[in-house]
């Protein structure tokens, strides 16, 4: 529905929506009627793109046509002519203008000289009613250059190079109603320049270099309705009545300037103003009485400024206001009674504002509110009487569910089950792997414990998703601020960090043994246990520090429904941002680089030492197996961490990251390592396969009653498990020679390749 038709609809049928709506259908708080049928649906099912009512009523009138769009239809119905390529649509095709420059087009009394390389205003007969001189090379408007055009109603001067406008340039234009000066280089407008333009209704001076305006700038503009000064370089508005000479001004657009503050006297004469747009300025201070004179104001747009404090009674006189935009301001606090006086407000934008003290009381007095816009969809729960609340999701959660996507809701259980089962299975099976390298086994069990925590984290998230199913929005804010969320988030970080540090430790052990075999020193039991304890302590510290200082970290884990602090938001504390970057782009990136480099070096070292081997075909085959294994361990690491590094890096560059990313990362990417580590580090290794083989062999032997004296493990070649550290079968371990896998490097170079298969 266009804003025009909405306007007429309202004119004929009155308000297009009321809380009681329909045929006196009464719905309970948070529910809204389905048109004229008795059915009521909750807020979250209205305006969600799905016909939930069955008669489309829940998807009708969802557009926010409040504020300027209505005003535009009211006063400026022909707006789009202004932007059309050919601004004129004369009724008569033949030219009625006496003398026309050869390069210009003419229809009726309208002249089109666009893009004709004009350097000055052309001289034509005085009966012309519209003149378009867009996209030319005009630099100056000298005195009396339009003096004879008493009938001229529309003058288009956009996209020239105008720097100089004589104080007498527009003298004689007594019939002019629309003047377009956009996209020029005007730095200053002298008081009196518009003195003769008593009938001017539209003055558009967008995209120029104006740095200062004062009330006398507009002297003579008694009929002005629309004034657009978008995208100039105004740094302040005068501390004098701006509308002194524009008593009929309805619409003032000052978007995209550099205005720092608004003075008390500025709007004192603007009593007819209905739309005031001041978005994208640098306003940092507002006085209590700044907007007091604007009692007819219908829309106030203060979005994207630097406002930190709103005086409690700043909106008290805006009884007619229907649309208010305060989005993207660093507002610290909103008073509970801030909006009490805005009885006619229909649309309220608070996007990008962290409302720490949010409460239903703030919005309850706004009985006509039909559209509200927040930073977080969780805030929608505080405005249950508002039919359309955006956003209705943060990409992770929706109004109904903690996990918005059905895929995520299913896979959170699948992934957590795989992760938990895989790791628990390895923890239980490790003791059965006959290996003298108990220290290595201890590291792997430690790794599995860490990875298991990731599974537990996902189970908890899945559990709370189930708990809040269908009504998440009611609990969202409390959930994200809850101890549960903090703890489960720190569990995920603990798992991640311990896992990363353990993998790095294991990789470095292996790297030193293979690349520098003669420098390899056997890590004793004491050292290994110390390292493991240190890793876990580090993990705990990293995970729980944010919980220790709320002032510094704010709600570190509670920035989203899955309680995982992946990417920082603008409002997150600087401390939290730095901390998050230090973890993901500091510790974890460094660890990832070490792992990639180590496996690369190991493969290169093995490849070099194998060149001298005699059995070429065997060698190539084994090298391929080794390459495949190394590739998979690095590939899974990359699969897990590269997306996280990219997201973190982009968020650091202030790139807009969709909320959906976090949930997909948390459910599908982050657990990759946790789910696959058991497979890569245990289930696919030779000792494990041999153990399974042994179990199977023993089982069959028992069945055939012929198991006595059978060897269960007798590989045909000297084999050393190097995945991820060498694990020697006891039959091949010569205590005096091979007391620790590192010492395997004393074996001749030619047999080295066998070590990896």
């Amino acid at each position: 529905m266009t804003s025009g038709s909405v306007f007429f609809y309202i004119l004929i049928f009155g308000k297009y929506f009321s809380h009681g709506g329909g045929q006196d259908v009464k719905c309970s708080l948070g529910y809204f009627p389905c048109g004229n049928i008795t059915k009521c649906l909750p807020q979250l099912l209205h305006c969600n793109g799905v016909d939930d009512c069955g008669n489309q009523a829940d998807e009708d009138n969802c557009g926010d046509n409040n504020g300027w769009s209505l005003q535009f239809d009211k006063y400026f119905a022909s707006y789009y002519k202004m932007t059309s390529q050919y601004p004129f649509e004369a009724e008569t095709p033949e030219c009625l203008v006496g003398s026309v420059p050869v390069q210009c087009l003419c229809q009726g009394l309208e002249l089109d000289c666009d893009e004709t390389n004009l350097r000055a205003v052309p001289s034509v007969s005085s009966n012309v009613t519209a003149m378009s001189l867009q996209w030319n090379l005009i630099r100056k408007l000298p005195p009396d250059c339009f003096k004879n055009y008493h009938d001229l109603q529309k003058l288009y001067l956009q996209n020239n190079k105008i720097t100089s406008i004589s104080i007498y340039a527009f003298r004689g234009l007594n019939s002019l109603t629309k003047l377009y000066l956009s996209h020029n280089r005007i730095t200053f407008l002298k008081p009196g320049v518009f003195e003769d333009l008593h009938r001017l209704e539209w003055l558009i001076i967008e995209d120029n270099h104006l740095s200062r305006i004062s009330p006398p700038t507009f002297y003579g503009l008694n009929s002005l309705i629309l004034l657009v000064l978008m995208n100039n370089v105004l740094t302040r508005l005068p501390d004098k009545p701006l509308c002194q000479h524009m008593p009929r001004l309805h619409w003032l657009d000052l978007e995209g300037n550099h205005i720092h503050n608004l003075r008390n006297l500025t709007f004192i004469s603007c009593s007819n103003l209905t739309v005031l747009v001041m978005r994208k300025n640098k306003i940092n201070h507002l006085n209590e009485n700044t907007f007091a004179p604007l009692q007819k104001l219908d829309e106030l747009d203060l979005g994207s400024n630097k406002i930190e404090n709103l005086p409690p009674l700043i909106f008290k006189d805006l009884k007619e206001l229907s649309q208010l935009n305060l989005s993207y301001n660093p507002i610290q606090k909103i008073q509970a009674n801030q909006f009490d006086y805005l009885v006619k407000l229909k649309s309220l934008s608070l996007e990008g504002i962290e409302i720490s003290n949010i409460q239903q009381r703030m919005f309850r007095p706004l009985m006509n509110l039909s559209h509200i816009y927040f930073k977080k969809f969780q805030y929608c729960g505080y405005a249950p009487h508002v039919r359309s609340c955006k956003p209705n999701t943060d990409g992770i959660s929706s109004l109904e569910n903690l996990l918005a996507s059905i895929i995520q809701r299913v896979f959170v259980w699948v992934v957590s089950a795989v992760t938990c089962f895989g790791n628990i299975f390895v923890i239980c099976m490790r003791p059965y792997i006959r290996s003298e390298n108990k220290l290595y086994a201890m590291s792997i069990i430690s790794l599995c414990c860490a990875d298991c925590l990731m599974g537990i984290y996902l189970f908890v998230i899945g559990g709370f998703d189930l708990k809040f199913r269908g009504e998440y929005n009611k609990h969202a804010q409390l959930w994200m601020e809850s101890t549960h969320c903090q703890l489960v988030g720190s569990l995920a970080i603990l798992s991640t960090e311990v896992s990363v540090l353990l993998l790095t430790f294991l990789t470095l052990e292996k790297y030193i043994c293979i690349v520098y075999p003669f420098r390899c020193v056997r890590p004793g039991k004491c050292r290994t246990i110390t390292v493991l304890i240190l890793i876990w302590i580090t993990g705990f510290i990293v995970a729980f520090i944010p919980l220790s200082n709320k002032e510094f970290f704010k709600n570190y884990y509670g920035t989203n429904g899955v309680c995982f602090p992946l990417h920082s938001e603008d409002t997150e504390s600087i401390g939290a941002q730095i901390y998050s970057v230090a973890i993901f782009l500091g510790i974890n990136l460094a660890a990832f680089i070490i792992i990639v480099f180590s496996y690369g070096s190991m493969f290169y070292s093995v490849h070099q030492s194998a060149i001298t081997a005699t059995e070429i075909r065997n060698q190539v085959k084994k090298e391929m197996i080794l390459a495949k294994r190394f590739f998979f361990i690095v590939f899974t690491d990359a699969l897990c961490w590269i997306p996280i590094f990219v997201v973190k890096f982009l968020s650091l560059l202030q790139v807009e990251i969709p909320g959906t990313i976090t949930s997909w990362v948390v459910i599908f990417i982050l657990p990759i390592n946790s789910a696959l580590n058991p497979i890569l580090y245990t289930l696919t290794t030779r000792p494990f396969k041999e153990m399974i083989h042994r179990f199977w062999y023993n089982y069959r032997q028992r069945k055939s009653m012929d198991s006595k004296g059978q060897k269960t493990y007798a590989p045909s070649f000297i084999w050393v498990e190097m995945w991820p550290l060498q694990e020697m079968p006891p039959e091949l371990m010569k205590p005096d020679l091979f007391t620790y896998p590192c010492e395997m490097s004393l074996i001749s170079q030619s047999t080295r390749l066998n070590s990896y298969s």
Partner: antibody, heavy 122, light 107 residues
């Protein structure tokens, strides 16, 4: 506060043009007209013309259109008036003065320089 | 051009006196009349603009009145520092024009 600084005196030979300066401070130089006023010894004030630094527009008294050229240097907030082919008739005190049009259409020359005494003599 | 006439070229008064200086325009100037004070050292100051509005920092003993073509400046309580020449100026149309000045002296 608004200040307009002019050199105290200039001695010129007849026929050799002279350029008088006026350095402005304490306000936005680009936003106001700069006026030049002549006062011959023991006589009244005569308006020569005015110049707007924002776009170099000038309005000259017809009487002085061949005598005075008005310019300005925005970067140094300095206004200039060049007198061509001076004669003894041009010996006078020349004032620069700011036109206040903040209350347009009420306009007044609100701040004046100390004046430069020009003596045309061979 | 609009001619501005100050009929009295000089006048003497005593300290504390009420002094009135008049000025006439050759045509209606719609109250666009300003008054200036020039001290003996040559410094010029704006006193009154738009017939009767006092410029900032000007003592309240100065006042202005008039309309159409006839205007006047009044000093209600003459002080030593008021010894100067006073000029009227019309700001209605260009070129701006000044009166010949009235020199105020102490008796």
């Amino acid at each position: 506060q608004v200040q307009l600084q002019q050199p105290g005196a200039e001695l010129v030979r007849p026929g050799a043009s002279v350029k008088l300066s006026c350095k402005a401070s304490g306000y936005s130089f680009n936003s106001y007209w700069m006026n030049w006023v002549k006062q011959r010894p023991g006589q009244g004030l005569e308006w020569i013309g005015m110049f707007h630094p924002s776009d170099s527009e000038s309005r000259l008294n017809q009487k002085f259109k061949d005598k005075a050229t008005l310019t300005a240097d925005k970067s140094s907030s300095t206004a200039y008036m060049q007198l061509s082919s001076p004669t003894s008739e041009d010996s006078a005190v020349y004032y620069c003065a700011r036109l206040d049009d903040d209350n347009y259409p009420l306009q007044s020359v609100d701040y004046w320089g100390q004046g430069t005494s020009v003596t045309v003599s061979s | 051009d609009i001619q501005m006439t100050q009929t009295t070229s000089s006048l003497s008064a005593s300290l504390g006196d009420r002094v009135t200086i008049s000025c006439r325009a050759s045509q209606d100037i719609s109250n666009h009349l300003n008054w200036y004070q020039q001290k003996p050292d040559g410094t010029v100051k704006l006193l009154i603009y738009y017939t009767s509005r006092l410029h900032s920092g000007v003592p309240s003993r100065f006042s202005g009145s008039g309309s159409g073509t006839d205007y006047s400046l009044t000093i209600s309580n003459l002080e030593q520092e008021d010894v100067a020449t006073y000029f009227c100026q019309q700001g209605n149309t260009l070129p701006l024009t000044f009166g010949a000045g009235t020199k105020l002296e102490l008796k």
